[in-house]
Every structure is written in structure tokens, then in C-alpha cells.
């Protein structure tokens, strides 16, 4: 065509895949009549007629564009719908009169790739690899034109670096004409890269300008040899007998080496291997003072069979020994004195306390308790508590029972019991003294005796209520080497007047599940009469 060398650069029209391209014929009225135009596509320098305009009416030519072309803007613009990457070419319009002129349009097609898909090396990377090892792959699917990939480590772009960083990329053309970009990052990693965050970025262009998409960030498993081994003990701080203690071996290598924990034997001066659980943890539960000692950990690299030893760690399981009280079984006369002494050993400084067993009242802070002018009431339990103030919960106790010599002492002097005739009655009588008394009853029945403690005894009697018994009542007598004492139980028949709701009497009803003349397991519960306490 004459003058083709001087042709101006084609007009650029940019459009996204799937949208409509508007190809405006830029011929002026002087260059040609727009009511008589031929449209061509140019591919590999070959022109193909695709559309004719005659008297402002458009007609598609058979072929790949037949269904996608239409006229707009009073015939000046050709609309191409459903643009594909294959449409990226030159389109030209040619006017017929007064002389043949043409106007060229370069169609540029764009498509954003999908989100980049990053996959990290699932097997990890050793730091001593001979050459850069595959860290991760990045795939950007269905973009047009080919997007550019940039790899990042900790937010900084990675550059090719001989024998250190290598980025290998390739692209494939899908049947749609879109590109899939694949890239693999190879790098020589160091121990510090174990926490490094890698990601890939796709840079691409759209009609609206430059854009980018980032993959998610990934960390790659990094393998490095163990350089240091150490022991950790849980819980931290002071340990005591009874605690659950875990001695854990740790190493700075990945994967962790094989561990063994050993304890120094002070007598043989040799280390003895301890039995650890599957995780290489030595669990002491409950911890005992014998667990105290010097522990160390040995870590084995099973590939090289090189072993590393930790710094030894002294473990102290604090303890309080059994508490000893002297005298162990004190006996005293009324009015005399007593000194109780408490002893115990511990790995720490001890504090002693004396408490009254029955009331938990603190009597003395210190190992020695002195008691003067002993009364009968002073008999009973005294508890020595040996504790380590710096370790809460570390304490031991010992109970000692003090016996005061004296004749029997009755729990009550007299008691009234409400009964029904022919019921089986369960009566009880309690006495204390030192030596321990025995109890006898003045009536026949089934009696049983039980020790409440070394100085106290409780006797129960099952007896049938008879008219004679109602008349005489029941006596229990407690006796020991130093004397005797008696309690009386008065039996009163129940009648309706005794059970008025507003009655002021505080005597209780003896309940019975037995019917008359039956000797079943019927019981009678007694309530004490309000009376001054009688102590023999």
C-alpha cells in the first residue's frame, strides 16, 4: 500500500477478557465515508475481512467473529463482545470513497490471574544442603498476559543470588488462551529461617493500571543440628515431697534428638539412666526426697551418633521427716506439769506449732509445749505441726494423747427417757477416765461396749421395757482402779398429755419401730434433760 511506511501508530484499545471492546473508526470525513467501511482483523500480517458497513448498515462476514460484532454510534464504532486473549490483534477500518484510507486499532486484552496458590515444601529443608533446596511453589492460574512473580522473605523481595537463591518459573497456555504461571523458589536456608515468612506476589496489568495479588504467608520446616542441650524442671521454684515433678530434656535442634536423662548416684559416683516417658520426659510422681540429686541429659543425633551432654542440674525435693513427740504417750496426775517436745528433720528451716486437737487452737509456737497444774479437762489430743514457712503445703504433724489419771467421769448424771411398754429400748452410757473405765448395767439385756478413744468408753444396752423396769429405772456404773461413778436413766411412759404442742417440757420421746411384744430392731433415741452438768 503506498505510504504504508509513514503510517501512524495504531490507536490502543485496552479491554478485559469477557467484556466488550469498542473499536471506533477514526477516519475523518475527508478520509472516507463512514457509511461505506470494511473492517479487517490482522493476524500474523494476514488481513481477514470480518465486517462490512454499507449505507450505515452492518453485516458480519462468516468466521470466528460472526456472532460477536455489531455496529454502534451511528455506524462509527464496531462493538466486539466476549473478548478473549485470541482477540489481541490489530483491527482496521477502511473507507471506500473518495479514496481508500485505513485506520488501525491495536486491541490489548487483560485478565487478572487467580489468587496465587503457594505450597510449601512438606518435607522441610536442612540447613546444610549442598545447593539451594526447593522452598515453595507458587501457581498463578488464568492470567493474561503472563503475570510477573516476585518472591518475598519476611516482607523483602528475594533476588537471584548465585548458590543461595534461585527462582525458576514457567508458563503454560490453557485452551482458553490464558496463561498459568508456575514458579519455584529454591534457596539455601539458615537456622534463623525457621521462623521466616515466605510469600509470592503476582504483578499484572489491567486497563485500570498495574495491580498485584499476594499469596498467604508460609513458614518452611527448617532442619538444623543440635548445638545445645539443657534440662528444664516443672514446676519451677521450690519442690516438695508429694509434688508431680517433670524433668524435661530440651535441645535447640530440629528435629529434636533422642534424649536420655540420668541421675548421679552419690555412693557409686556414677550416672544411672532414668526411665522417661515416650516424649523423653522424666516424671516423678509423687516426688520423694530420694529423688534429690544431680541430673543431666544426653542428646543423641541418630544419623551421626554424636552425643551432647547438658549442664548438670541439682534437683532438691524438700521434705519434712516424720515428726517425733516425747513423751509419746504421756500420763499425768491432776495438778502436775508436763513438757511435750517435738522434733523433725527437714531440708529447710522448720517452724513448730502446738495445737489442741479438739479445737485447733494454737497453744504454742515452737517445738516445746509446757503444761502446768493439769486438770482433768487437759486430757486429750495435742498436735505438733512441723512446717516449712517458705514452701506452702510442706508440713508434717504428729498427734499425742495426754491421759490424766482419775476416777470415771460420766457424760451425764441423770436422764429421763420417754418409752412405751413392751418396746425394745436402746440405751447408751458414756464415761471417761484414766485408766480407761469399764461400764456395767444393773439390769439384764444385751450390752456392747466400744472405745471412743483410749480414755473414753461408750456402752449401749438393748432392753425390753417392763413394768418392773419402769418402776426401778436403769443404772450404768463406770469403774476403774481409782474409783467408780453411776448414771441413772428414768423411764417415763408416754401418754397424750405429755405430747401437747405447746408443752414446755424438753424431754424427748423414745421412738420405736417395734410393735408390742416384738423384739425387733427397734430403737429409742433419747434427748437430754436440761440440767446442770454433773461430772461425778
Amino acid at each position: 500500500v503506498p505510504g504504508e511506511a509513514e503510517q501512524p501508530a495504531p490507536e490502543l484499545v485496552e479491554v478485559e477478557v469477557g467484556s466488550t471492546a469498542l473499536l471506533k473508526c477514526g477516519l475523518s470525513q475527508s478520509q472516507g465515508n463512514l457509511s461505506h467501511v470494511d473492517w479487517f482483523s490482522v493476524h500474523k500480517e494476514k488481513r481477514t475481512l470480518i465486517f462490512r458497513v454499507r449505507q450505515g448498515q452492518g453485516q458480519s462476514e462468516p468466521g470466528e467473529y460472526e456472532q460477536r460484532l455489531s455496529l454502534q454510534d451511528r455506524g462509527a464504532t464496531l462493538a466486539l463482545t466476549q473478548v478473549t486473549p485470541q482477540d489481541e490483534r490489530i483491527f482496521l477500518c477502511q473507507g471506500k470513497r473518495p479514496r481508500s484510507q485505513e485506520y488501525r486499532i491495536q486491541l490489548r486484552v487483560y485478565k487478572a490471574p487467580e489468587e496465587p496458590n503457594i505450597q510449601v515444601n512438606p518435607l522441610g529443608i536442612p540447613v546444610n544442603s549442598k545447593e539451594p533446596e526447593e522452598v515453595a511453589t507458587c501457581v498463578g492460574r488464568n492470567g493474561y498476559p503472563i503475570p510477573q512473580v516476585i518472591w518475598y522473605k519476611n516482607g523483602r523481595p528475594l533476588k537471584e543470588e548465585k548458590n543461595r537463591v534461585h527462582i525458576q518459573s514457567s508458563q503454560t497456555v490453557e485452551s482458553s488462551g490464558l496463561y498459568t504461571l508456575q514458579s519455584i523458589l529454591k534457596a539455601q536456608l539458615v537456622k534463623e529461617d525457621k521462623d521466616a515468612q515466605f510469600y509470592c506476589e503476582l504483578n499484572y496489568r489491567l486497563p485500570s493500571g498495574n495491580h498485584m495479588k499476594e499469596s498467604r504467608e508460609v513458614t518452611v520446616p527448617v532442619f538444623y543440628p543440635t548445638e545445645k542441650v539443657w534440662l528444664e524442671v516443672e514446676p519451677v521454684g521450690m519442690l516438695k515431697e508429694g509434688d508431680r515433678v517433670e524433668i524435661r530434656c530440651l535441645a535447640d535442634g530440629n528435629p529434636p534428638p533422642h534424649f536420655s536423662i540420668s541421675k548421679g548416684n552419690p555412693s557409686t559416683r556414677e550416672a544411672e539412666e532414668e526411665t522417661t516417658n515416650d516424649n523423653g520426659v522424666l516424671v516423678l510422681e509423687p516426688a520423694r526426697k530420694e529423688h534429690s540429686g544431680r541430673y543431666e541429659c544426653q542428646a543423641w543425633n541418630l544419623d551421626t551418633m554424636i552425643s551432647l551432654l547438658s549442664e548438670p542440674q541439682e534437683l532438691l525435693v524438700n521434705y519434712v521427716s516424720d515428726v517425733r513427740v516425747s513423751p509419746a504417750a504421756p500420763e499425768r496426775q491432776e495438778g502436775s506439769s508436763l513438757t511435750l517436745t517435738c522434733e523433725a528433720e527437714s531440708s529447710q528451716d522448720l517452724e513448730f506449732q502446738w495445737l489442741r486437737e479438739e479445737t485447733d487452737q494454737v497453744l504454742e509456737r515452737g517445738p516445746v509445749l509446757q503444761l502446768h497444774d493439769l486438770k482433768r479437762e487437759a486430757g486429750g489430743g495435742y498436735r505438733c505441726v512441723a512446717s516449712v514457712p517458705s514452701i506452702p503445703g510442706l508440713n508434717r504433724t504428729q498427734l499425742v494423747k495426754l491421759a490424766i489419771f482419775g476416777p470415771p467421769w460420766m457424760a451425764f448424771k441423770e436422764r429421763k427417757v420417754w418409752v412405751k411398754e413392751n418396746m425394745v429400748l436402746n440405751l447408751s452410757c458414756e464415761a471417761s477416765g484414766h485408766p480407761r473405765p469399764t461400764i456395767s448395767w444393773n439390769v439384764n439385756g444385751t450390752a456392747s461396749e466400744g472405745d471412743q478413744d483410749p480414755q473414753r468408753v461408750l456402752s449401749t444396752l438393748n432392753v425390753l421395757v417392763t413394768p418392773e423396769l419402769l418402776e426401778t429405772g436403769v443404772e450404768c456404773t463406770a469403774s476403774n482402779d481409782l474409783g467408780k461413778n453411776t448414771s441413772i436413766l428414768f423411764l417415763e411412759l408416754v401418754n397424750l398429755t405429755t405430747l401437747t404442742p405447746d408443752s414446755n417440757t424438753t424431754t424427748g420421746l423414745s421412738t420405736s419401730t417395734a410393735s408390742p411384744h416384738t423384739r425387733a430392731n427397734s430403737t429409742s433415741t433419747e434427748r437430754k434433760l436440761p440440767e446442770p452438768e454433773s461430772r461425778g
Epitope: 496458590n117 505450597q119 510449601v120 515444601n121 512438606p122 518435607l123 529443608i125 536442612p126 544442603s129 549442598k130 545447593e131 539451594p132 533446596e133 526447593e134 511453589t137 501457581v139 514457567s170 508456575q182 514458579s183 519455584i184 529454591k186 498467604r216 520446616p221
Partner: antibody, heavy 118, light 106 residues
Framework: QVTLKESGPVLVKPTETLTLTCTVS????????VSWVRQPPGKALEWIAA???????YYNSAFKSRLTISRDTSKSQVVLTMTNMDPVDTATYYC????????????WGQGTLVTVSS | DIQMTQSPSSLSASVGDRVTINCKAS??????LAWYQQKPGKAPKVLIF???SLQTGIPSRFSGSGSGTDFTLTISSLQPEDFATYYC????????FGQGTKLEIK
């Protein structure tokens, strides 16, 4: 085209060492990693070991102490040795190529059945 | 180790049926999953990689979906040659396979 072919004994005795060779063609061992995967009769697939394109070796921790994987790039061969064989190691052993831009196996050998029996 | 659990372990279907096979990972594996088909006496063949990408040369009736812990292989219209055992495989941390799903003719 890409091919992988396993070779080695079909029968080994308990406690003996198994040596399997995978000979590849259509690609270079320096561009693609190779794995060994086994499948006991009627059971699922189990990954055993791998060697990367850079020569790094990886093992399934369940067999680690018994395995060695190596390669001879000039012969395009990958060799797996497994010591102290046991009847439970009876399986079809496959070598498989790792896809260059991914971590899955895009080409497999036809497999070789190894029986462990006295 | 990451465990992969496939369901069902076997299923019967007819030519033309739509079939789905599920695979569950014991932890998040993002989309680091492949599906393989294995016929008796043959080596496995990769169908899907990266959870949803179709391997070159595999018919489009095969598709994969899911991410995180739950994944599905779908065959939109069963063909006679599709009766086989299917395995999922994770490549997020090490390599582990599911126990397989045997697809049989009804």
C-alpha cells in the same frame, strides 16, 4: 516420555536387607525429586522416603533407622535400601516422580511386589 | 502426623451417576491435597492437585473442591473406566494418604 521402572528381588528373607533400584528416563534427577511409596496387599499407600532434586534425603520416621535412599544422576537411578526386613514389609514398592512445580506425584513406576518370607 | 480419613470406604454406582468421595484431614492443610485413581495391578494416577486443579489429560468430569480439613472428589457422570480405588493424599506436612475408597459397579 517420562518413565520410571523399579527393579530388585521379589523375595527376601526376614532380617535380610532389601535393595530396590528405580531407573528413570525422560527427565533429570536434578530437576525432579523422587519418592518411594509402598502398598501392602489390599491396603493403602504409604510414603517411605524421598530424595530431592538437590540431593537432600528424607525418610518416614516410622522406618527411619532402617532406610537409606541415594541416587546416581549419571545412571538416572535412585536406590532404596531397607534393613531388617519383616513379613509385614511385604508390599508392592513404587517409585514416583515429584512434579517440578508442586509436591504431588505426577508419574509412577509400575511397582514391584516384594515378599518377605523364610 | 496428619491423618487422612476417606469416606465412604466403598460405594456402588452405575454408569452416568454423579459420585462424591470425601476426605478429611486431622488438621488444617489449606489446599495441599491431591487425588489419585488406582486400578487393580496398576500404579496410582494423579487426577487433581492443589485440591481443585485438574491434572493435564484428565477428563473434566473429575473435579475437586474443599480447603482446610474437608475435601471432595466429584465424578459428574460415571464412565465404565472410572471404576477403581481412589486415594487422597496430603502434602502439607510430610506425605500421608487416605485409606482409599473402592468404587464398584452397582
Amino acid at each position: 516420555q517420562v518413565t520410571l521402572k523399579e527393579s530388585g528381588p521379589v523375595l527376601v528373607k526376614p532380617t535380610e536387607t532389601l535393595t530396590l533400584t528405580c531407573t528413570v528416563s525422560g527427565f533429570s534427577l536434578t530437576s525432579n525429586g523422587v519418592s518411594w511409596v509402598r502398598q501392602p496387599p489390599g491396603k493403602a499407600l504409604e510414603w517411605i522416603a524421598a530424595i530431592s532434586s538437590g540431593g537432600t534425603t528424607y525418610y518416614n520416621s516410622a522406618f527411619k533407622s532402617r532406610l537409606t535412599i541415594s541416587r546416581d544422576t549419571s545412571k538416572s537411578q535412585v536406590v532404596l535400601t531397607m534393613t531388617n526386613m519383616d513379613p509385614v514389609d511385604t508390599a508392592t514398592y513404587y517409585c514416583a516422580r515429584r512434579y517440578g512445580y508442586g509436591w504431588y506425584f505426577d508419574f509412577w513406576g509400575q511397582g514391584t511386589l516384594v515378599t518377605v518370607s523364610s | 502426623d496428619i491423618q487422612m480419613t476417606q469416606s465412604p470406604s466403598s460405594l456402588s454406582a452405575s454408569v452416568g451417576d454423579r459420585v462424591t468421595i470425601n476426605c478429611k484431614a486431622s488438621q488444617n492443610i489449606y489446599n495441599s491435597l491431591a487425588w489419585y485413581q488406582q486400578k487393580p495391578g496398576k500404579a496410582p494416577k494423579v487426577l487433581i492437585f492443589n485440591a481443585n486443579s485438574l491434572q493435564t489429560g484428565i477428563p473434566s468430569r473429575f473435579s475437586g473442591s474443599g480447603s482446610g480439613t474437608d475435601f471432595t472428589l466429584t465424578i459428574s457422570s460415571l464412565q465404565p473406566e472410572d471404576f477403581a480405588t481412589y486415594y487422597c493424599q496430603q502434602f502439607y506436612s510430610g506425605y500421608t494418604f487416605g485409606q482409599g475408597t473402592k468404587l464398584e459397579i452397582k
